[in-house]
Interface confidence: low
Protein backbone atom coordinates (compact mmCIF):
# COMPACT_ATOMS: atom_id res chain seq x y z
CA UNK A 1 0.00 0.00 0.00
CA UNK A 2 1.34 3.44 -0.84
CA UNK A 3 0.92 6.90 -2.47
CA UNK A 4 1.70 7.95 -6.23
CA UNK A 5 2.26 12.07 -5.45
CA UNK A 6 2.35 14.54 -8.28
CA UNK A 7 3.41 18.22 -7.60
CA UNK A 8 2.08 20.57 -10.13
CA UNK A 9 4.74 23.23 -10.15
CA UNK A 10 4.06 25.51 -13.28
CA UNK A 11 1.61 25.61 -16.36
CA UNK A 12 2.44 28.14 -19.39
CA UNK A 13 0.04 28.77 -22.04
CA UNK A 14 1.10 32.44 -23.05
CA UNK A 15 -1.26 32.69 -26.04
CA UNK A 16 -4.47 31.34 -23.81
CA UNK A 17 -5.62 29.08 -26.20
CA UNK A 18 -7.16 25.86 -26.38
CA UNK A 19 -5.68 22.58 -28.03
CA UNK A 20 -7.91 23.25 -31.13
CA UNK A 21 -6.35 26.59 -31.53
CA UNK A 22 -9.16 28.13 -30.69
CA UNK A 23 -8.51 31.18 -27.56
CA UNK A 24 -10.44 30.62 -24.57
CA UNK A 25 -12.82 33.87 -23.49
CA UNK A 26 -11.51 35.67 -21.78
CA UNK A 27 -8.78 33.63 -20.76
CA UNK A 28 -8.36 29.88 -20.05
CA UNK A 29 -9.35 29.17 -16.91
CA UNK A 30 -7.65 26.43 -16.14
CA UNK A 31 -7.62 22.73 -14.35
CA UNK A 32 -6.29 19.09 -14.10
CA UNK A 33 -7.26 15.60 -14.74
CA UNK A 34 -4.52 13.01 -13.77
CA UNK A 35 -4.51 9.24 -14.93
CA UNK A 36 -2.28 6.80 -13.23
CA UNK A 37 -2.27 3.25 -14.70
CA UNK A 38 -0.30 -0.02 -15.48
CA UNK A 39 2.89 0.29 -17.70
CA UNK A 40 2.07 1.10 -21.37
CA UNK A 41 4.24 0.62 -24.09
CA UNK A 42 2.11 3.02 -25.94
CA UNK A 43 0.11 5.07 -23.67
CA UNK A 44 -3.54 4.17 -24.77
CA UNK A 45 -7.07 5.67 -23.52
CA UNK A 46 -9.15 3.21 -21.01
CA UNK A 47 -9.32 2.41 -17.31
CA UNK A 48 -6.60 4.28 -14.82
CA UNK A 49 -6.25 1.23 -13.23
CA UNK A 50 -4.13 2.85 -10.66
CA UNK A 51 -6.76 5.78 -10.34
CA UNK A 52 -7.29 9.27 -11.00
CA UNK A 53 -7.80 12.51 -9.53
CA UNK A 54 -8.54 16.29 -10.49
CA UNK A 55 -7.53 19.57 -9.39
CA UNK A 56 -9.99 22.54 -9.10
CA UNK A 57 -9.38 25.17 -11.24
CA UNK A 58 -5.59 26.59 -10.29
CA UNK A 59 -4.89 29.03 -12.43
CA UNK A 60 -5.24 31.29 -15.96
CA UNK A 61 -3.21 30.92 -18.91
CA UNK A 62 0.35 30.71 -17.30
CA UNK A 63 0.74 30.30 -13.70
CA UNK A 64 2.93 28.68 -10.95
CA UNK A 65 0.90 26.42 -8.85
CA UNK A 66 2.28 26.75 -5.28
CA UNK A 67 2.89 23.97 -2.89
CA UNK A 68 -0.42 23.33 -1.09
CA UNK A 69 0.80 20.56 1.00
CA UNK A 70 0.84 22.29 4.86
CA UNK A 71 -2.18 23.55 4.52
CA UNK A 72 -4.45 20.08 4.08
CA UNK A 73 -4.59 21.32 0.24
CA UNK A 74 -4.44 19.60 -3.12
CA UNK A 75 -0.97 19.91 -4.43
CA UNK A 76 0.89 17.37 -4.34
CA UNK A 77 -1.84 15.38 -5.70
CA UNK A 78 -2.14 12.14 -3.91
CA UNK A 79 -2.98 9.16 -5.84
CA UNK A 80 -3.26 6.15 -3.03
CA UNK A 81 -3.00 2.52 -4.01
CA UNK A 82 -3.45 -0.64 -1.85
CA UNK A 83 -1.52 -2.90 -3.87
CA UNK A 84 2.23 -3.66 -4.09
CA UNK A 85 3.85 -1.53 -6.47
CA UNK A 86 4.98 -2.89 -9.46
CA UNK A 87 7.93 -0.37 -10.15
CA UNK A 88 6.37 0.90 -13.61
CA UNK A 89 3.54 3.02 -14.32
CA UNK A 90 1.90 5.03 -16.82
CA UNK A 91 0.75 8.80 -16.41
CA UNK A 92 -1.47 11.10 -18.57
CA UNK A 93 -2.39 15.00 -17.42
CA UNK A 94 -5.00 16.54 -19.01
CA UNK A 95 -5.02 20.36 -19.06
CA UNK A 96 -9.00 21.53 -19.19
CA UNK A 97 -10.45 24.93 -19.46
CA UNK A 98 -13.66 25.31 -17.10
CA UNK A 99 -15.82 28.12 -19.00
CA UNK A 100 -18.07 27.76 -16.01
CA UNK A 101 -18.11 26.34 -12.17
CA UNK A 102 -18.98 22.70 -12.98
CA UNK A 103 -15.63 20.72 -13.75
CA UNK A 104 -17.25 17.50 -14.17
CA UNK A 105 -16.35 15.93 -18.06
CA UNK A 106 -20.07 15.58 -19.15
CA UNK A 107 -20.38 19.36 -17.97
CA UNK A 108 -17.33 20.83 -20.92
CA UNK A 109 -17.48 21.03 -24.08
CA UNK A 110 -15.31 18.46 -25.50
CA UNK A 111 -13.31 20.74 -27.15
CA UNK A 112 -12.50 22.34 -23.78
CA UNK A 113 -8.86 20.47 -23.60
CA UNK A 114 -5.80 22.32 -23.26
CA UNK A 115 -3.17 20.05 -23.23
CA UNK A 116 -2.62 16.35 -22.64
CA UNK A 117 0.74 14.50 -22.09
CA UNK A 118 1.47 10.88 -21.46
CA UNK A 119 4.75 8.95 -20.21
CA UNK A 120 5.50 5.83 -19.01
CA UNK A 121 8.61 4.51 -17.23
CA UNK A 122 10.00 2.98 -14.22
CA UNK A 123 9.51 4.61 -10.54
CA UNK A 124 11.17 2.97 -7.72
CA UNK A 125 9.47 3.52 -4.22
CA UNK A 126 11.62 6.39 -2.40
CA UNK A 127 11.17 10.26 -1.09
CA UNK A 128 13.04 11.87 -4.07
CA UNK A 129 10.94 13.71 -6.23
CA UNK A 130 11.55 13.30 -10.47
CA UNK A 131 11.52 16.23 -11.87
CA UNK A 132 10.14 16.40 -15.78
CA UNK A 133 8.68 19.33 -18.17
CA UNK A 134 6.27 18.62 -20.89
CA UNK A 135 6.06 20.83 -23.95
CA UNK A 136 3.93 21.20 -26.79
CA UNK A 137 3.86 23.65 -29.40
CA UNK A 138 1.54 25.87 -27.04
CA UNK A 139 1.78 24.86 -23.51
CA UNK A 140 4.63 23.99 -21.18
CA UNK A 141 3.67 21.81 -18.25
CA UNK A 142 6.82 21.09 -15.37
CA UNK A 143 5.96 18.86 -12.62
CA UNK A 144 7.72 16.18 -10.42
CA UNK A 145 6.45 12.85 -8.64
CA UNK A 146 7.64 10.04 -6.60
CA UNK A 147 6.01 7.28 -4.64
CA UNK A 148 5.64 6.70 -0.97
CA UNK A 149 4.88 3.72 1.31
CA UNK A 150 1.65 4.56 3.42
CA UNK A 151 1.76 4.22 6.93
CA UNK A 152 2.99 1.24 8.65
CA UNK A 153 4.24 -0.07 5.00
CA UNK A 154 7.90 -0.64 4.23
CA UNK A 155 9.90 -2.32 1.39
CA UNK A 156 10.85 -1.68 -2.19
CA UNK A 157 7.67 -2.23 -3.19
CA UNK A 158 5.22 -1.08 -0.05
CA UNK A 159 4.37 -4.82 0.33
CA UNK A 160 5.78 -5.40 4.18
CA UNK A 161 3.49 -4.26 6.38
CA UNK A 162 5.15 -3.58 9.91
CA UNK A 163 3.51 -1.73 12.99
CA UNK A 164 5.63 -0.25 15.97
CA UNK A 165 4.83 -1.74 19.30
CA UNK A 166 5.46 -2.05 23.04
CA UNK A 167 3.12 -4.34 24.69
CA UNK A 168 2.83 -7.92 25.71
CA UNK A 169 3.34 -9.01 22.22
CA UNK A 170 6.23 -7.01 20.99
CA UNK A 171 8.46 -4.26 21.99
CA UNK A 172 9.92 -3.14 18.53
CA UNK A 173 10.03 -0.23 15.70
CA UNK A 174 9.96 -0.94 12.14
CA UNK A 175 13.17 -0.61 9.96
CA UNK A 176 13.17 0.99 6.34
CA UNK A 177 12.75 -2.02 5.00
CA UNK A 178 10.11 -3.36 7.26
CA UNK A 179 11.76 -5.69 9.53
CA UNK A 180 11.44 -5.15 13.04
CA UNK A 181 13.99 -3.33 15.40
CA UNK A 182 13.45 -4.52 19.54
CA UNK A 183 13.56 -1.40 21.46
CA UNK A 184 16.40 -1.26 24.31
CA UNK A 185 16.07 -4.78 26.51
CA UNK A 186 14.02 -6.43 24.32
CA UNK A 187 15.36 -9.56 22.08
CA UNK A 188 13.79 -12.63 19.90
CA UNK A 189 12.07 -12.88 16.59
CA UNK A 190 8.89 -10.48 17.61
CA UNK A 191 10.96 -8.69 20.56
CA UNK A 192 8.80 -10.54 23.22
CA UNK A 193 12.15 -11.70 24.97
CA UNK A 194 13.07 -9.27 27.55
CA UNK A 195 16.98 -9.71 27.86
CA UNK A 196 18.00 -10.12 31.72
CA UNK A 197 20.10 -8.42 33.86
CA UNK A 198 23.66 -8.87 33.11
CA UNK A 199 25.22 -12.35 34.41
CA UNK A 200 21.83 -13.46 35.30
CA UNK A 201 22.54 -17.30 35.87
CA UNK A 202 20.92 -18.83 32.08
CA UNK A 203 19.14 -21.55 33.53
CA UNK A 204 18.53 -20.55 37.42
CA UNK A 205 17.24 -17.19 36.73
CA UNK A 206 14.70 -15.30 34.30
CA UNK A 207 12.77 -11.87 33.55
CA UNK A 208 9.75 -10.86 32.67
CA UNK A 209 11.09 -7.20 31.95
CA UNK A 210 14.42 -5.84 31.02
CA UNK A 211 17.40 -5.93 33.75
CA UNK A 212 15.55 -8.06 35.97
CA UNK A 213 17.02 -11.40 37.51
CA UNK A 214 14.08 -13.35 39.22
CA UNK A 215 15.16 -16.64 40.45
CA UNK A 216 13.42 -19.85 39.98
CA UNK A 217 12.66 -21.95 42.94
CA UNK A 218 16.03 -23.11 44.72
CA UNK A 219 18.09 -20.72 44.18
CA UNK A 220 18.85 -16.91 45.39
CA UNK A 221 21.50 -14.13 44.90
CA UNK A 222 21.71 -10.92 42.53
CA UNK A 223 22.21 -13.36 39.79
CA UNK A 224 20.48 -16.28 40.85
CA UNK A 225 23.70 -18.10 41.14
CA UNK A 226 23.32 -19.20 44.96
CA UNK A 227 21.49 -22.33 45.69
CA UNK A 228 19.13 -22.49 48.24
CA UNK A 229 20.45 -25.66 50.80
CA UNK A 230 17.62 -27.98 52.32
CA UNK A 231 15.38 -26.60 54.95
CA UNK A 232 16.89 -27.37 58.20
CA UNK A 233 20.80 -27.90 57.20
CA UNK A 234 23.08 -27.02 59.96
CA UNK A 235 26.70 -26.87 59.19
CA UNK A 236 26.42 -27.70 55.28
CA UNK A 237 25.90 -26.10 51.60
CA UNK A 238 24.31 -27.09 48.05
CA UNK A 239 25.88 -27.15 44.77
CA UNK A 240 22.06 -27.87 43.46
CA UNK A 241 19.01 -26.75 45.42
CA UNK A 242 17.28 -28.52 48.72
CA UNK A 243 20.97 -30.34 49.20
CA UNK A 244 22.81 -30.09 52.38
CA UNK A 245 26.31 -31.31 52.26
CA UNK A 246 28.58 -31.39 55.18
CA UNK A 247 31.39 -29.03 56.39
CA UNK A 248 34.15 -30.94 56.94
CA UNK A 249 33.93 -32.95 60.33
CA UNK A 250 29.82 -32.77 60.64
CA UNK A 251 27.64 -35.46 59.30
CA UNK A 252 24.13 -36.22 59.79
CA UNK A 253 21.20 -35.80 57.47
CA UNK A 254 21.13 -32.17 58.47
CA UNK A 255 24.89 -31.97 58.49
CA UNK A 256 24.60 -31.65 62.40
CA UNK A 257 26.92 -34.23 63.81
CA UNK A 258 30.33 -33.72 64.90
CA UNK A 259 32.55 -36.54 62.58
CA UNK A 260 36.38 -36.60 61.71
CA UNK A 261 36.83 -39.09 59.45
CA UNK A 262 36.97 -36.52 56.63
CA UNK A 263 38.92 -34.30 58.54
CA UNK A 264 41.82 -36.74 59.48
CA UNK A 265 42.02 -38.36 56.05
CA UNK A 266 40.97 -36.28 53.40
CA UNK A 267 40.14 -38.97 51.76
CA UNK A 268 37.90 -37.14 48.53
CA UNK A 269 39.91 -35.91 45.14
CA UNK A 270 39.30 -33.74 42.93
CA UNK A 271 37.98 -30.41 45.33
CA UNK A 272 34.81 -33.21 46.20
CA UNK A 273 33.46 -32.49 49.29
CA UNK A 274 33.78 -34.57 51.87
CA UNK A 275 30.91 -36.14 54.19
CA UNK A 276 31.22 -38.33 57.76
CA UNK A 277 28.52 -40.95 57.78
CA UNK A 278 29.76 -43.26 60.87
CA UNK A 279 33.10 -44.50 61.82
CA UNK A 280 35.42 -44.73 59.37
CA UNK A 281 32.60 -44.05 56.92
CA UNK A 282 32.31 -41.13 54.38
CA UNK A 283 30.89 -39.48 51.53
CA UNK A 284 32.30 -37.66 48.72
CA UNK A 285 30.04 -35.34 46.81
CA UNK A 286 32.11 -34.61 43.84
CA UNK A 287 32.24 -31.80 41.86
CA UNK A 288 30.70 -30.94 38.19
CA UNK A 289 32.65 -33.46 35.83
CA UNK A 290 33.97 -36.14 37.82
CA UNK A 291 32.50 -39.37 39.38
CA UNK A 292 33.62 -42.53 41.67
CA UNK A 293 33.95 -43.24 45.47
CA UNK A 294 36.35 -40.84 46.16
CA UNK A 295 35.47 -38.17 43.14
CA UNK A 296 38.85 -39.55 41.27
CA UNK A 297 37.49 -40.36 37.91
CA UNK A 298 36.93 -37.38 35.49
CA UNK A 299 33.05 -37.50 34.30
CA UNK A 300 31.96 -36.88 30.28
CA UNK A 301 29.65 -33.77 31.29
CA UNK A 302 27.24 -35.33 28.67
CA UNK A 303 27.10 -38.03 30.45
CA UNK A 304 24.24 -36.67 32.53
CA UNK A 305 22.41 -36.72 28.80
CA UNK A 306 21.46 -32.79 29.09
CA UNK A 307 20.39 -32.84 25.25
CA UNK A 308 16.48 -33.21 25.10
CA UNK A 309 14.12 -34.07 22.56
CA UNK A 310 16.63 -36.26 20.54
CA UNK A 311 19.51 -33.64 20.61
CA UNK A 312 22.95 -35.60 20.39
CA UNK A 313 25.82 -34.27 22.65
CA UNK A 314 28.86 -33.40 21.70
CA UNK A 315 31.85 -32.82 24.50
CA UNK A 316 33.93 -29.95 24.29
CA UNK A 317 36.94 -28.53 26.26
CA UNK A 318 34.81 -25.91 28.36
CA UNK A 319 31.68 -27.70 28.30
CA UNK A 320 29.27 -29.50 26.04
CA UNK A 321 27.39 -28.69 22.48
CA UNK A 322 23.57 -30.28 21.95
CA UNK A 323 23.37 -30.74 17.92
CA UNK A 324 19.70 -30.74 17.85
CA UNK A 325 17.14 -32.53 15.36
CA UNK A 326 15.19 -31.06 12.52
CA UNK A 327 12.38 -29.12 14.28
CA UNK A 328 14.57 -27.90 17.51
CA UNK A 329 16.59 -25.64 18.44
CA UNK A 330 17.78 -24.07 21.67
CA UNK A 331 21.32 -24.90 24.16
CA UNK A 332 19.55 -27.83 24.78
CA UNK A 333 17.05 -28.73 21.86
CA UNK A 334 14.30 -27.19 23.98
CA UNK A 335 12.34 -25.78 21.45
CA UNK A 336 10.68 -26.76 18.69
CA UNK A 337 10.14 -24.74 15.50
CA UNK A 338 7.03 -25.17 12.99
CA UNK A 339 7.32 -28.11 10.48
CA UNK A 340 5.07 -30.29 8.22
CA UNK A 341 4.30 -31.92 11.25
CA UNK A 342 2.20 -28.87 12.37
CA UNK A 343 0.13 -28.91 9.20
CA UNK A 344 0.65 -25.49 8.01
CA UNK A 345 -0.63 -26.19 4.58
CA UNK A 346 -3.73 -24.97 3.85
CA UNK A 347 -6.97 -25.82 1.45
CA UNK A 348 -5.07 -29.44 0.56
CA UNK A 349 -1.98 -27.86 0.12
CA UNK A 350 1.23 -30.72 0.24
CA UNK A 351 3.69 -29.75 3.08
CA UNK A 352 7.70 -30.49 2.07
CA UNK A 353 10.15 -30.59 4.26
CA UNK A 354 13.76 -28.24 3.40
CA UNK A 355 17.08 -27.86 5.38
CA UNK A 356 16.58 -31.64 6.87
CA UNK A 357 13.00 -30.41 8.48
CA UNK A 358 14.62 -26.93 9.69
CA UNK A 359 11.60 -25.17 7.66
CA UNK A 360 9.28 -26.56 5.21
CA UNK A 361 7.17 -24.88 2.02
CA UNK A 362 3.89 -25.33 0.71
CA UNK A 363 2.90 -27.09 -3.10
CA UNK A 364 -0.57 -25.74 -3.65
CA UNK A 365 -3.71 -27.30 -5.94
CA UNK A 366 -4.70 -25.37 -8.30
CA UNK A 367 -6.28 -22.31 -7.41
CA UNK A 368 -4.53 -21.57 -4.30
CA UNK A 369 -2.24 -19.69 -3.39
CA UNK A 370 0.44 -18.33 -0.56
CA UNK A 371 3.01 -19.52 1.31
CA UNK A 372 0.45 -21.42 2.90
CA UNK A 373 -2.00 -22.06 0.65
CA UNK A 374 -4.74 -19.63 1.96
CA UNK A 375 -5.21 -17.01 -0.65
CA UNK A 376 -8.04 -18.36 -3.45
CA UNK A 377 -6.90 -17.59 -7.06
CA UNK A 378 -9.97 -15.75 -8.91
CA UNK A 379 -8.66 -15.74 -12.74
CA UNK A 380 -11.83 -13.53 -13.62
CA UNK A 381 -11.05 -10.34 -11.53
CA UNK A 382 -9.78 -8.77 -14.27
CA UNK A 383 -12.67 -8.97 -16.72
CA UNK A 384 -11.20 -10.34 -19.38
CA UNK A 385 -14.18 -11.44 -21.69
CA UNK A 386 -14.73 -8.46 -24.00
CA UNK A 387 -18.27 -7.57 -26.14
CA UNK A 388 -20.84 -8.44 -22.45
CA UNK A 389 -18.93 -11.99 -22.30
CA UNK A 390 -19.15 -14.04 -18.58
CA UNK A 391 -15.87 -15.08 -17.40
CA UNK A 392 -16.64 -18.32 -15.54
CA UNK A 393 -13.73 -19.91 -13.01
CA UNK A 394 -13.07 -23.45 -14.37
CA UNK A 395 -10.72 -25.04 -11.91
CA UNK A 396 -7.05 -23.78 -12.68
CA UNK A 397 -8.47 -21.53 -15.78
CA UNK A 398 -10.96 -19.28 -17.31
CA UNK A 399 -13.19 -19.42 -19.91
CA UNK A 400 -15.78 -16.90 -21.35
CA UNK A 401 -18.95 -17.55 -22.43
CA UNK A 402 -20.03 -15.36 -25.58
CA UNK A 403 -23.52 -13.64 -26.29
CA UNK A 404 -24.86 -13.97 -29.59
CA UNK A 405 -23.00 -13.01 -32.00
CA UNK A 406 -19.45 -13.42 -30.52
CA UNK A 407 -16.65 -15.81 -30.58
CA UNK A 408 -13.15 -16.55 -29.58
CA UNK A 409 -10.93 -16.96 -26.26
CA UNK A 410 -12.10 -13.55 -25.09
CA UNK A 411 -14.89 -12.83 -27.02
CA UNK A 412 -13.15 -10.67 -28.63
CA UNK A 413 -14.35 -11.70 -32.25
CA UNK A 414 -17.62 -10.78 -33.97
CA UNK A 415 -19.31 -13.42 -36.03
CA UNK A 416 -20.81 -12.85 -39.15
CA UNK A 417 -24.01 -14.69 -39.18
CA UNK A 418 -23.98 -15.35 -42.82
CA UNK A 419 -20.64 -17.27 -43.10
CA UNK A 420 -21.74 -20.88 -42.82
CA UNK A 421 -24.55 -19.95 -45.59
CA UNK A 422 -27.58 -20.65 -43.50
CA UNK A 423 -30.24 -19.99 -46.27
CA UNK A 424 -31.64 -23.25 -47.77
CA UNK A 425 -32.46 -23.38 -51.86
CA UNK A 426 -30.37 -20.52 -52.56
CA UNK A 427 -31.96 -17.76 -50.33
CA UNK A 428 -30.02 -14.81 -49.98
CA UNK A 429 -28.54 -14.57 -46.33
CA UNK A 430 -28.60 -11.04 -44.94
CA UNK A 431 -26.54 -10.41 -41.58
CA UNK A 432 -28.63 -8.18 -39.31
CA UNK A 433 -27.61 -6.57 -35.73
CA UNK A 434 -29.35 -9.16 -33.53
CA UNK A 435 -29.11 -12.04 -36.05
CA UNK A 436 -30.06 -13.04 -39.96
CA UNK A 437 -32.38 -13.00 -42.36
CA UNK A 438 -33.59 -15.09 -45.31
CA UNK A 439 -34.86 -13.69 -48.66
CA UNK A 440 -36.10 -17.06 -49.95
CA UNK A 441 -36.86 -17.78 -53.86
CA UNK A 442 -39.95 -18.51 -55.25
CA UNK A 443 -41.24 -21.59 -53.52
CA UNK A 444 -39.89 -21.39 -50.61
CA UNK A 445 -40.52 -20.04 -47.51
CA UNK A 446 -39.50 -20.29 -43.71
CA UNK A 447 -36.85 -18.54 -41.53
CA UNK A 448 -34.34 -20.38 -43.51
CA UNK A 449 -36.24 -21.43 -46.75
CA UNK A 450 -36.26 -24.63 -45.58
CA UNK A 451 -40.56 -24.98 -46.28
CA UNK A 452 -41.04 -25.95 -49.97
CA UNK A 453 -44.24 -23.95 -50.83
CA UNK A 454 -46.69 -25.47 -53.27
CA UNK A 455 -47.33 -22.84 -56.39
CA UNK A 456 -50.27 -23.11 -58.79
CA UNK A 457 -48.33 -22.83 -61.67
CA UNK A 458 -52.39 -22.91 -63.81
CA UNK A 459 -53.08 -19.56 -61.68
CA UNK A 460 -52.05 -17.44 -64.40
CA UNK A 461 -53.90 -19.21 -67.28
CA UNK A 462 -51.24 -20.05 -69.86
CA UNK A 463 -53.09 -22.79 -71.78
CA UNK A 464 -55.17 -20.91 -74.78
CA UNK A 465 -57.67 -22.23 -76.81
CA UNK A 466 -59.74 -23.14 -74.00
CA UNK A 467 -56.73 -25.89 -72.76
CA UNK A 468 -57.30 -27.60 -69.98
CA UNK A 469 -54.35 -26.90 -66.90
CA UNK A 470 -52.45 -29.26 -65.03
CA UNK A 471 -49.81 -28.64 -61.90
CA UNK A 472 -47.24 -30.70 -62.34
CA UNK A 473 -46.31 -30.71 -58.24
CA UNK A 474 -42.75 -32.70 -58.42
CA UNK A 475 -41.32 -29.67 -60.50
CA UNK A 476 -44.10 -27.02 -59.65
CA UNK A 477 -44.55 -26.16 -63.95
CA UNK A 478 -47.81 -26.69 -65.95
CA UNK A 479 -49.16 -28.85 -68.25
CA UNK A 480 -51.48 -28.33 -71.37
CA UNK A 481 -54.27 -30.96 -71.51
CA UNK A 482 -54.67 -29.55 -75.89
CA UNK A 483 -58.60 -29.93 -77.07
CA UNK A 484 -58.88 -31.27 -81.00
CA UNK A 485 -57.44 -29.28 -83.27
CA UNK A 486 -54.52 -27.54 -81.08
CA UNK A 487 -51.00 -28.64 -80.20
CA UNK A 488 -47.86 -27.04 -78.78
CA UNK A 489 -46.77 -27.14 -75.00
CA UNK A 490 -49.60 -24.13 -74.69
CA UNK A 491 -52.18 -25.28 -76.96
CA UNK A 492 -50.97 -22.24 -79.17
CA UNK A 493 -51.53 -23.80 -82.85
CA UNK A 494 -54.27 -24.97 -84.70
CA UNK A 495 -53.03 -28.11 -86.18
CA UNK A 496 -52.33 -27.95 -90.10
CA UNK A 497 -51.80 -24.44 -89.62
CA UNK A 498 -47.67 -24.78 -89.24
CA UNK A 499 -46.06 -21.86 -86.71
CA UNK A 500 -44.46 -19.29 -89.06
CA UNK A 501 -40.23 -19.46 -88.23
CA UNK A 502 -38.38 -16.51 -89.88
CA UNK A 503 -36.86 -18.45 -91.48
CA UNK B 1 -2.23 -9.17 32.47
CA UNK B 2 -3.14 -11.87 29.34
CA UNK B 3 -5.70 -14.19 30.27
CA UNK B 4 -7.59 -17.12 28.29
CA UNK B 5 -10.04 -19.07 30.12
CA UNK B 6 -11.12 -22.88 28.80
CA UNK B 7 -15.17 -24.11 29.42
CA UNK B 8 -17.16 -26.17 27.96
CA UNK B 9 -15.73 -29.69 28.31
CA UNK B 10 -17.36 -32.24 30.21
CA UNK B 11 -18.29 -35.89 30.50
CA UNK B 12 -19.92 -36.91 26.85
CA UNK B 13 -20.76 -40.43 25.03
CA UNK B 14 -19.09 -41.88 21.98
CA UNK B 15 -20.83 -40.08 19.13
CA UNK B 16 -22.16 -36.59 20.96
CA UNK B 17 -21.10 -33.48 20.68
CA UNK B 18 -19.65 -30.69 22.61
CA UNK B 19 -18.86 -27.10 22.15
CA UNK B 20 -15.99 -25.32 24.27
CA UNK B 21 -15.54 -21.60 23.99
CA UNK B 22 -12.11 -19.58 25.22
CA UNK B 23 -12.64 -16.20 26.52
CA UNK B 24 -9.64 -14.17 26.28
CA UNK B 25 -8.60 -10.68 28.00
CA UNK B 26 -5.59 -8.69 28.57
CA UNK B 27 -4.58 -7.94 25.00
CA UNK B 28 -6.17 -6.75 21.38
CA UNK B 29 -8.08 -9.70 20.32
CA UNK B 30 -8.92 -9.42 16.99
CA UNK B 31 -5.21 -8.91 16.23
CA UNK B 32 -4.69 -12.51 16.79
CA UNK B 33 -4.52 -16.18 16.04
CA UNK B 34 -6.35 -18.14 18.82
CA UNK B 35 -5.88 -22.55 18.65
CA UNK B 36 -6.48 -25.57 20.65
CA UNK B 37 -4.41 -27.95 21.38
CA UNK B 38 -5.08 -31.01 23.78
CA UNK B 39 -2.76 -33.25 25.76
CA UNK B 40 -3.97 -36.88 26.77
CA UNK B 41 -2.28 -38.85 29.89
CA UNK B 42 1.08 -39.65 28.64
CA UNK B 43 1.14 -38.48 25.26
CA UNK B 44 2.68 -35.69 23.90
CA UNK B 45 0.65 -32.49 23.62
CA UNK B 46 -1.39 -32.28 20.28
CA UNK B 47 -2.55 -28.90 18.06
CA UNK B 48 -5.39 -29.55 16.36
CA UNK B 49 -7.33 -26.36 15.14
CA UNK B 50 -6.46 -22.71 14.72
CA UNK B 51 -7.75 -19.66 13.31
CA UNK B 52 -6.44 -16.47 11.74
CA UNK B 53 -6.90 -13.16 13.22
CA UNK B 54 -9.79 -12.38 10.56
CA UNK B 55 -11.25 -15.77 10.83
CA UNK B 56 -10.23 -16.29 7.51
CA UNK B 57 -7.84 -19.17 7.76
CA UNK B 58 -8.31 -22.37 9.57
CA UNK B 59 -6.58 -25.54 9.88
CA UNK B 60 -7.76 -28.72 11.28
CA UNK B 61 -5.13 -31.82 12.51
CA UNK B 62 -6.08 -34.51 9.97
CA UNK B 63 -7.51 -36.77 13.47
CA UNK B 64 -10.53 -34.18 13.67
CA UNK B 65 -10.82 -32.81 10.24
CA UNK B 66 -14.70 -32.97 9.59
CA UNK B 67 -15.51 -33.30 13.37
CA UNK B 68 -14.44 -30.51 14.93
CA UNK B 69 -15.25 -26.35 13.58
CA UNK B 70 -13.06 -23.43 14.90
CA UNK B 71 -15.18 -20.13 14.48
CA UNK B 72 -14.08 -16.47 16.92
CA UNK B 73 -16.79 -13.98 17.69
CA UNK B 74 -14.54 -10.39 17.94
CA UNK B 75 -17.25 -8.67 19.51
CA UNK B 76 -17.40 -11.01 21.84
CA UNK B 77 -13.24 -11.73 22.79
CA UNK B 78 -13.84 -15.10 22.61
CA UNK B 79 -13.21 -18.19 20.06
CA UNK B 80 -15.34 -21.94 20.10
CA UNK B 81 -14.57 -25.27 19.42
CA UNK B 82 -17.66 -27.45 17.93
CA UNK B 83 -16.94 -31.16 18.64
CA UNK B 84 -19.14 -33.64 16.66
CA UNK B 85 -18.82 -37.48 16.18
CA UNK B 86 -16.67 -37.49 19.46
CA UNK B 87 -14.65 -40.66 19.57
CA UNK B 88 -12.82 -41.84 23.10
CA UNK B 89 -9.92 -41.06 21.66
CA UNK B 90 -10.80 -37.89 22.07
CA UNK B 91 -10.42 -37.52 25.85
CA UNK B 92 -7.98 -35.04 27.03
CA UNK B 93 -7.52 -32.08 28.52
CA UNK B 94 -8.40 -29.10 26.09
CA UNK B 95 -6.07 -25.93 26.30
CA UNK B 96 -7.08 -22.39 24.18
CA UNK B 97 -3.42 -20.26 23.53
CA UNK B 98 -2.68 -17.61 21.09
CA UNK B 99 1.36 -17.05 19.40
CA UNK B 100 0.57 -13.99 20.13
CA UNK B 101 0.86 -12.63 16.49
CA UNK B 102 -1.79 -12.58 13.46
CA UNK B 103 -1.17 -16.22 11.57
CA UNK B 104 -1.39 -19.69 13.29
CA UNK B 105 2.34 -19.95 14.40
CA UNK B 106 3.61 -21.22 17.21
CA UNK B 107 2.34 -20.63 21.45
CA UNK B 108 3.11 -17.79 23.27
CA UNK B 109 0.33 -17.86 25.95
CA UNK B 110 -1.92 -20.59 27.22
CA UNK B 111 -5.13 -21.13 29.36
CA UNK B 112 -5.55 -23.32 32.15
CA UNK B 113 -7.47 -25.88 30.62
CA UNK B 114 -10.52 -28.24 30.27
CA UNK B 115 -11.00 -31.98 30.73
CA UNK B 116 -13.22 -33.42 27.74
CA UNK B 117 -14.28 -36.79 28.50
CA UNK B 118 -15.70 -39.06 26.02
CA UNK B 119 -16.89 -43.04 26.94
CA UNK B 120 -17.82 -45.70 24.95
Known amino acids: SGVFQLQLQEFINERGVLASGRPCEPGCRTFFRVCLKHFQAVVSPGPCTFGTVSTPVLGTNSFAVRDDSSGGGRNPLQLPFNFTWPGTFSLIIEAWHAPGDDLRPEALPPDALISKIAIQGSLAVGQNWLLDEQTSTLTRLRYSYRVICSDNYYGDNCSRLCKKRNDHFGHYVCQPDGNLSCLPGWTGEYCQQPICLSGCHEQNGYCSKPAECLCRPGWQGRLCNECIPHNGCRHGTCSTPWQCTCDEGWGGLFCDQDLNYCTHHSPCKNGATCSNSGQRSYTCTCRPGYTGVDCELELSECDSNPCRNGGSCKDQEDGYHCLCPPGYYGLHCEHSTLSCADSPCFNGGSCRERNQGANYACECPPNFTGSNCEKKVDRCTSNPCANGGQCLNRGPSRMCRCRPGFTGTYCELHVSDCARNPCAHGGTCHDLENGLMCTCPAGFSGRRCEVRTSIDACASSPCFNRATCYTDLSTDTFVCNCPYGFVGSRCEFPVGLPPSFPW | EVQLVESGGGLVQAGGSLRLSCAAS????????IGWFRQAPGKEPEGISCISSSGGITYYADSVKGRFTISRDNAKNTVYLQMNSLKPEDTAVYYC?????????????TGQGTQVTVSS
Open chain 2, 26 to 33: GFTFDDYA
Open chain 2, 97 to 109: ATPGIAACRGIHY
